[in-house]
Amino acid sequence: IWELKKDVYVVELDWYPDAPGEMVVLTCDTPEEDGITWTLDQSSEVLGSGKTLTIQVKEFGDAGQYTCHKGGEVLSHSLLLLHKKEDGIWSTDILKDQKEPKNKTFLRCEAKNYSGRFTCWWLTTISTDLTFSVKSSRGSSDPQGVTCGAATLSAERVRGDNKEYEYSVECQEDSACPAAEESLPIEVMVDAVHKLKYENYTSSFFIRDIIKPDPPKNLQLKPLKNSRQVEVSWEYPDTWSTPHSYFSLTFCVQVQGKSKREKKDRVFTDKTSATVICRKNASISVRAQDRYYSSSWSEWASVPCS
Amino acid sequence: RNLPVATPDPGMFPCLHHSQNLLRAVSNMLQKARQTLEFYPCTSEEIDHEDITKDKTSTVEACLPLELTKNESCLNSRETSFITNGSCLASRKTSFMMALCLSSIYEDLKMYQVEFKTMNAKLLMDPKRQIFLDQNMLAVIDELMQALNFNSETVPQKSSLEEPDFYKTKIKLCILLHAFRIRAVTIDRVMSYLNAS
């Protein structure tokens, strides 16, 4: 058993049929010694008396808010949560496996630049009685500070018969140099509590590996005289690290119709302009990627050909 | 410690081309190592990230773009003395800071070159003959060093009398390649910045 936060405790249980469970001793936070009784949740049934209560925790029915009273007055609470371990593996029932970039990916994180700011998100089908708490650091043995905000519900989607909820959190490394060469990864830890179930999820990464620039901005087309070609130009996204001559991007320019199956024109360039063949009913799209360290491409920025 | 704005004329910077070749060569070599040593811990997640130049050179600080010198977090610089002459510098326009930066890059290359050559000598003794260093990568390191053209003491190649542990050598190769790729990215960024300034 360990303390998650004040008056909230996590009991780690090996979860299998007829498991013996864990013996837990609760102590009432009071100077009083006599006349103390214990109850669980909203029940008025007295579970025991005395300053300490010893319970055998085997299942979710044994978890919950234990309260010690004296003469009708509440003295203190202890909330017991369960963390299940099945076949030596901690349960991951609360969050959905996003399977990208690999199986057992519950947390996904991205950074728009090298400033040390990043966003992580996760998915769940659970809509109520759900809380998250996020901590992060650079390295684990001698951790350096990373500050995370509160996790918020950022999107709701319908997936077949199910509703899916996306939560996200923004974090910022306390003292980040955009030009630094990372040797220790960022660690992100998410505590998830659903009703009386506790789970924790972690992710470890270098900012350089989670870079995904914003799409290029200000796409413009200039038809070329006596030709089917057009010159397309764009600018670096505002959120990208500066100076741009140091943090350079490379671009992919594509002309394609509405369907992915349609024919296309595609060219890669390090410049902020390119010449392509425009077709009726097609769009010109441009996306960006770090020129020197190939992490993710940005989303496409698009303009219609016509 | 930063790069000044007064740097060589555009297109007059022979090191840019060599640094692009360097990044390409080390990336290819790392990819090859990851494929060949698939049953060894050779991915970014599996290895320890070590920097053999730590406390010996200070390339990131010495080559910091002017725009980042206002960032306190970028200025935990280490004092290191460097030799200051070189042919990538556009003669009179060269500043002391830029010489310091390029000299630091040269020292990095020299250190990695020695490590790679020592390692290759060990790998050539491996009866499995599983992996060797790409001669192209070693040649590209050499070309960039020649383009930088700094005079510095030659570092003797480390020789070892004991029987090499090939498993450890291959893991060290992965560690070295990962670190060198990161440094090659920094070098490429620096050369691009200098070329554009």
């Epitope: 349609e262 024919k263 296309k264 024109d265 595609r266 360039t269 010449t275 063949i277 | -």
Partner: antibody
Framework: EVQLVQSGAEVKKPGATVKISCKAS????????LHWVRQRPEKGLEWMGW????????EYAPKFQGKVTITADTSTDTGYLELSSLRSEDTAVYYC???????????WGQGTLVTVSS | DIQMTQSPSSVSASVGDRVTITCRAS??????LHWYQQKPGKAPKLLIK???QSISGVPSRFSGSGSGTDFSLTINSLQPEDFATYYC?????????FGGGTKVEIK
């Protein structure tokens, strides 16, 4: 299977015109760009131009502008290359090539040898 | 027009050898470069697109690298069926242009 089948070899006199064909099968003809590439004896490859069979748009290499005409007939899934004012240096194998992407060549015809000789 | 220069123009090698062919562009073309193999009396065949992207059905011993002006095609362990002429082609701008070719011959 995506395939391009070209017409047979031609022998022409200098000054004449020749029209060679390239019949597409295994895909929707208008879904791919169609290119023509020349290869002179013991020489390399030269790109001549492309057509978008969907709308008839064409683009020619400056070197071949006025010399060649590329057309396409969507009713027969066939592309054509017409070479005019033939000279001995036009003796070559002419390949048609197709791709959904405009700038490189995924599928090739077997080639048509055009010999210009008096 | 962008000139593409291949080297060497021919190379003699044995089965099992590692062969590298290079291609240089007269100006920077990013990764807009493709490689083809041509056997005598046959049409060219696409091997690699956009400098390093593999093509399905092409053996993994063929790999490409490069960007900007310098590119290379590597055949890792030469097989009897690999003796052919190899061409690079730039797609950075029209007109599309090819290198002069590199003939890989049996030693």
């Amino acid at each position: 299977e995506v395939q391009l089948v070209q017409s047979g070899a031609e022998v022409k006199k200098p000054g004449a015109t020749v029209k060679i064909s390239c019949k597409a099968s295994g895909y929707t003809f208008s879904d791919y760009y169609l290119h023509w590439v020349r290869q002179r004896p013991e020489k390399g490859l030269e790109w001549m131009g492309w057509i978008d069979p969907e709308n008839g748009d064409t683009e020619y290499a400056p070197k071949f502008q006025g010399k060649v005409t590329i057309t396409a007939d969507t009713s027969t899934d066939t592309g054509y290359l017409e070479l005019s004012s033939l000279r001995s240096e036009d003796t070559a194998v002419y390949y048609c090539a197709a791709n959904k992407e405009l700038r490189y060549f995924d599928v090739w015809g077997q080639g048509t040898l055009v010999t210009v000789s008096s | 027009d962008i000139q593409m220069t291949q080297s060497p123009s021919s190379v003699s090698a044995s089965v099992g050898d590692r062969v590298t062919i290079t291609c240089r562009a007269s100006q920077s073309i990013s990764i807009n470069l493709h490689w083809y193999q041509q056997k005598p009396g046959k049409a060219p065949k696409l091997l690699i697109k956009f400098a390093s992207q593999s093509i399905s059905g092409v053996p993994s011993r063929f790999s490409g690298s490069g960007s900007g002006t310098d590119f290379s095609l590597t055949i890792n362990s030469l097989q009897p069926e690999d003796f052919a002429t190899y061409y690079c082609q730039q797609s950075n701008s029209f007109p599309l242009t090819f290198g002069g070719g590199t003939k890989v011959e049996i030693k």
